[in-house]
């Protein structure tokens, strides 16, 4: 049997050591003990008694099925206890009585059906994070379960086999910053929602089939809910259940952010929110995020005209990797307050983008992200976006563009352009001179000779440049990142010719460690202030004698350099 390895600060690692019991020889010097991935099965009353100063105890996936009632009695300093993914079919309040300092407790993934006969947590007054439940057996949440807990930063409940929720079970916790609920269906959702309205600031619902969700008025008095964010992950919705969910918003008037991640919509977008009387109550929602939305019948999807009015005040919308090929012109025109729009990883092409960015579309838009779509012509793209009078930032990275023409038109306020990973080989005057930030990283550029009088930041890593670009091209440059190119050297003169340069990242290039370069680096200790990745990323490529040495450590041969 292997032994523990401990460092000088008392952090002991005993993961995956084939322990069949808690190892002997534990001492009061231990601050942290990780015995995960063993085959311990049993923790006896004396096994941990020597660990009086232990602050962290991690016992996950160690096949523990029995813990004696007083096994943790000496662990008054313990702040972090992880018992997740073991074989504990019942939980005992006597384990937690002595753990008055505990801040983090993870009991998830054990095969218990309830949280025990009596309240488990009344002494855990410092608890900040609690994770409970499992996929297959945890079937009941009762009023006694959370007694004694008044405030939590994070509460995660995996109740994917829930058969009974006792009303008001979660109401006793007065303040929960982030509640994650794994529910397989919506059966108890309304009851739970009523209980957490006045306590939860961020509610995350996971893996819930909401297809049969039906709203009914909540049995609550006028409540000022602190909920600011609502997220659905891995959920299933229909057009009808979406309408029903919207009715919940009348109870959370401070809601500012809604997120749908990895969800499925078994519908056509035939929403009818006017019936749900929520149009005015969506007033505070500023951010809507949709990622990986799966719509089996996306090719029959409606134009969403029924939700136009819902979204008039929204400022930030992300719809990522969801097969978006068109935002109808009339929809774009209704998004009057929209300042940020991210349509990354979709199916946008120029002809449909033209319809989306029609006259009067997105009048407040400042940032548009069209990364990884199917755009081909930089010239057309710029021309189409001329309608966006307030656009300052455009990300069209990860599109495969045709060669860049000599001239292009762009929105006149544009200051930031991301052309990374677009396959470009040459930069031309198509790139607007108004830019303050330009990202052309991960392309096939072997030179850069474009005058950009206002450019403050240039990102040109992962290209094929052999030298730093000429400083006269960028008179006000502050930041240049030129990692992973083929730059072989830089000199005092080169760096000095950038009058305002504050940050240069030039590591992982093919440096030829010549006498000049090495004497410059030796004579200039201030390099560390400008080269943010100095010294570890600056290695000699040649001569062979110095290959792999850091420039900082490499010493030129006296013979070579003083001939």
């Amino acid at each position: 049997q292997e032994s523990l390895s401990c460092d000088a600060s008392g952090v002991c690692d005993g993961r995956s050591r084939s322990f069949t019991s808690i190892p002997s020889g534990l001492t009061a010097a231990m601050k942290s003990l990780d015995l995960s991935f063993n085959k311990i099965t049993y923790i006896g009353h004396g096994d941990l008694r020597a660990c009086a100063n232990l602050q962290v105890l991690i016992l996950k996936s160690s096949r523990i099925n029995t813990i004696e009632g007083d096994a943790f009695y000496s662990l008054g300093s313990l702040e972090h206890l992880d018992l997740s993914d073991n074989h504990l079919s019942s939980l005992s309040s006597s384990w937690f009585g002595p753990l008055s300092s505990l801040k983090y407790l993870n009991l998830m993934g054990n095969p218990y059906q309830t949280l025990g006969v009596t309240s488990l947590f009344p002494n855990l007054t410092n608890l900040q994070t609690l994770r409970i439940g499992n996929v297959e057996t945890f079937s009941e949440i009762r009023r006694i379960d959370f007694a004694g807990l008044t405030s939590l930063n994070e509460l995660e409940i995996k109740a994917l086999s829930l058969r009974n929720y006792q009303s008001q079970s979660l109401k006793s916790i007065r303040d929960i910053h982030h509640l994650t609920l794994h529910l397989s269906e919506s059966a108890f959702l309304l009851e739970i929602f009523a209980d957490i309205l006045s306590s939860v600031r961020y509610l995350e619902l996971r893996d819930t089939n909401l297809a049969r969700f039906q709203f009914s008025p909540l049995p609550v008095d006028e409540v000022s809910s602190p909920m600011k964010k609502l997220a659905f992950r891995g959920s299933v919705l229909t057009d009808e259940s979406f309408n029903e969910l919207l009715k919940l918003l009348r109870y959370i008037l401070e809601l500012s952010e809604v997120e749908f991640d990895d969800c499925t919509l078994n519908g056509l977008g035939d929403f009818n929110p006017s019936e749900s009387d929520v149009v005015s109550e969506l007033g505070k929602v500023e951010t809507v995020t949709i990622r990986r939305l799966h719509i089996p019948q996306f090719y029959l999807f409606y134009d969403l005209s029924t939700v136009y009015s819902l979204l008039e005040k929204v400022k930030r919308i992300t719809v990522e990797n969801s097969k978006v090929f068109l935002v109808p012109c009339s929809f774009s025109q209704h998004l009057k307050s929209l300042e940020f729009l991210d349509l990354s990883e979709n199916l946008m092409v120029e002809e449909y983008l033209k319809n989306s960015a029609c006259k009067g579309a997105w009048p407040s838009l400042q940032t548009l992200v069209l990364s990884q779509n199917h755009l081909r012509s930089m010239q057309k793209t710029g021309e189409i976006l001329l309608t966006l009078k307030n656009l300052t930032s455009l990300d069209i990275s990860r599109n495969t563009f045709h060669p860049m023409p000599d001239s292009c038109q762009w929105p006149e306020k544009m200051r930031f352009l991301n052309l990374s990973s677009t396959g470009i080989r040459v930069v031309k005057t198509c790139i607007p001179q108004t830019l303050e930030v330009l990202d052309v990283s991960n392309n096939n550029l072997d030179s850069f000779s474009l005058f950009l009088p206002r450019l403050q930041e240039l990102y040109i890593s992962r290209n094929k440049l052999k030298t730093l670009p000429d400083a006269s091209l960028f008179p006000v440059l502050l930041v240049m990142k030129i990692r992973e190119n083929a730059v072989s050297t830089f000199s005092k003169d080169q760096l000095g010719s950038f009058p305002k340069l504050e940050t240069l990242e030039a590591g992982d290039n093919h440096f030829v460690c010549s006498c000049e370069l090495l004497s410059f680096t030796m004579e200039t200790p201030a390099l560390a202030q400008i080269l943010v990745d100095w010294p570890d990323s600056y290695l000699c490529d040649s001569p062979p004698r110095l290959h792999g040495h850091r420039l900082q450590d490499a010493r030129p041969s006296v013979l070579e350099c003083h001939q």
Epitope: T137, S161, S184, E185, G234, T264, R292
Partner: nanobody
Framework: EVQLVESGGGLVQAGGSLRLSCAAS????????MGWFRQAPGKEREFVSV????????DYASSVKGRFTISRDNAKNTVYLEMTSLEPEDTAVYYC???????????????WGQGTPVTVSS
């Protein structure tokens, strides 16, 4: 209606590995949550693992976590169970199931395969 056919079971020595497959017929495979269950001789059917429609969420019984891995390929209408560090206690008939709910309760699954036997010898 979905038909499920498991394969990949067999006899393996303790510490060995197996990969179970479950092929589904029907065009709506990606609309279902997929689960693996097992039943040892003389015992009740027990939950092993579950994966959501996209493959973005997975869960395991504590007895197999860290040793088994569930995955799915919606293009091939197939769900897999990669089993490593097998133990004699893993001997059972393994069933694949499809349903609408992401859960470990077997009764919530609508469609079941015929099962594939796995025997782990010591």
């Amino acid at each position: 209606e979905v038909q499920l056919v498991e394969s990949g079971g067999g006899l393996v020595q303790a510490g060995g590995s197996l990969r179970l497959s479950c092929a589904a017929s029907g065009r709506t495979f990606s609309s279902y949550v997929m689960g693996w269950f097992r039943q040892a001789p003389g015992k009740e059917r027990e939950f092993v693992s579950v994966i959501n429609r996209s493959g973005g969420s997975t869960d395991y019984a504590s007895s197999v976590k860290g040793r088994f891995t569930i995955s799915r390929d919606n293009a091939k209408n197939t769900v897999y169970l990669e089993m490593t560090s097998l133990e004699p206690e893993d001997t059972a008939v393994y069933y694949c199931a499809a349903g609408e709910y992401y859960t470990g309760i077997s009764s919530r699954y609508d469609y079941w395969g015929q099962g594939t036997p796995v025997t782990v010898s010591s």
